[in-house]
């Protein structure tokens, strides 16, 4: 797995370099997670023909994956820093159960899947420090998450492959939208 941000050898070799600002650290963290997702998507696409699945087929699912909407204030039109930050943190917290599901879904990229999960936890912590209105952030119910996880793991193999593909695709889109929005803050 690639070295997480802030741990690469260049940081050690250049002790006089300016430390990263909070925004730079968040930016770097998201890009690191996106690299991890790309590696996982590569394995998924090599293993099956899921990546050719039509948007229509993928839309016919009962997964409640977080998605950016106009009302979330993360798009250029109607941008609202506070509302958007709450949405990003809430969304990442909601993705955590799906990232847990991914942990046993990879054969050659097991470490990469773990790295994506752990790096997301770190990203959430970074963002929570940045947020002023932490009360507006709702944390998913652990009991609901546990039963969702059990249900996902009980699916047949084809459904599990499709679910894996959809989670990776949705998480990538959510992070890309978050990255664009955070660069405006």
């Amino acid at each position: 797995a690639p070295v997480p941000p802030g741990e690469d050898s260049k940081d050690v070799a250049a002790p006089h370099r300016q430390p990263l600002t909070s925004s730079e650290r968040i930016d770097k963290q998201i890009r690191y997670i996106l690299d991890g997702i790309s590696a996982l998507r590569k394995e998924t696409c090599n293993k099956s023909n899921m990546c050719e699945s039509s948007k229509e087929a993928l839309a016919e699912n009962n997964l409640n994956l977080p998605k950016m909407a106009e009302k979330d204030g993360c798009f250029q039109s109607g941008f609202n820093e506070e509302t958007c930050l709450v949405k990003i943190i809430t969304g990442l917290l909601e993705f955590e159960v799906y990232l847990e599901y991914l942990q046993n879904r990879f054969e050659s990229s097991e470490e990469q899947a773990r790295a994506v999960q752990m790096s997301t936890k770190v990203l959430i912590q970074f963002l929570q420090k940045k947020a002023k209105n932490l009360d507006a952030i709702t944390t998913p119910d652990p009991t609901t998450n546990a039963s969702l996880l059990t249900k996902l793991q009980a699916q047949n193999q084809w459904l599990q492959d499709m679910t894996t593909h959809l989670i990776l695709r949705s998480f990538k889109e959510f992070l890309q939208s978050s990255l664009r929005a955070l660069r405006q803050m």
Partner: antibody, heavy 119, light 111 residues
């Protein structure tokens, strides 16, 4: 052509164990999950559990935990089910069934192994 | 677990007529546009024979008079025209998730 060939009938004494086999051919054994199903005489069908031959991961119906043990042998493309501490309740036909894959591959069932528990 | 309720429990149909068997699931067996409902025929002393998979696809060598339809929670198996050889037990089964579950069966006879 996908085929699952199950071992022959078994007559066993109460308290004993039995191990039956399911030999797969016509497909890549490690790419598909293998399920086991029980059918008592004149009754319906009951799912026992499955094994993923790729990594030997198993999942069992709560009812059969401690009763059935699923294993597989990649080299011979064979799945096994062992039933322990047999009673008359275990007298049934047991089927192995390869899971399909979406609408591309259908499920495929073996011909069944009959187990009779009698003293 | 997904419960499958099959009806009727028994059915007598005249040769050449239509037989319809229903199967209702306690929750949807659909996923990503596919309905994971299968239909089996079983004759005494024989293993179950797969007639229909993923709700409407015919198994290999299955005559066209066997038709499956439905999505979500409501499914049916139609046999038309009824032939002598169709006298058997019929089961529905969901393979969306484990545990695999089965309907209670329908005994189809010639009237």
């Amino acid at each position: 052509e996908v085929q699952l060939q199950q071992s022959g009938p078994e007559l066993v004494k109460p308290g004993a164990s039995v191990k039956m086999s399911c030999k797969a051919s016509g497909y890549t054994f490690t790419s598909y999950v293998m399920h086991w199903v029980k059918q008592k005489p004149g009754q319906g069908l009951e799912w026992i559990g499955y094994i993923n031959p790729y990594n030997d991961g198993t999942k069992y119906n709560e009812k059969f935990k401690g009763k059935a043990t699923l294993t597989s042998d990649k080299s011979s493309s064979t799945a096994y089910m062992e039933l322990s501490s047999l009673t008359s309740e275990d007298s049934a036909v047991y089927y192995c069934a390869r899971e399909g894959y979406g609408n591309l591959e259908r499920d495929c069932w073996g011909q069944g192994t009959s187990v009779t528990v009698s003293s | 677990d997904i419960v499958l309720t099959q009806s009727p429990a028994s059915l007598a149909v005249s040769l050449g007529q239509r037989a319809t068997i229903s199967c209702r699931a306690s929750e949807s067996v659909d996923g990503f546009g596919i309905s994971f409902m299968n239909w089996f025929q079983q004759k005494p002393g024989q293993p179950p024979k797969l007639l229909i998979y993923v709700a409407s696809n015919q198994g290999s060598g299955v005559p066209a008079r066997f038709r499956g339809r439905g999505r979500g929670t409501d499914f049916s198996l139609n046999i038309h025209p009824m032939e002598e050889d169709d006298s058997a037990m019929y089961f529905c089964q969901q393979s969306k998730e484990v545990p695999w579950t089965f309907g209670g069966g329908t005994k189809l006879e010639i009237k």
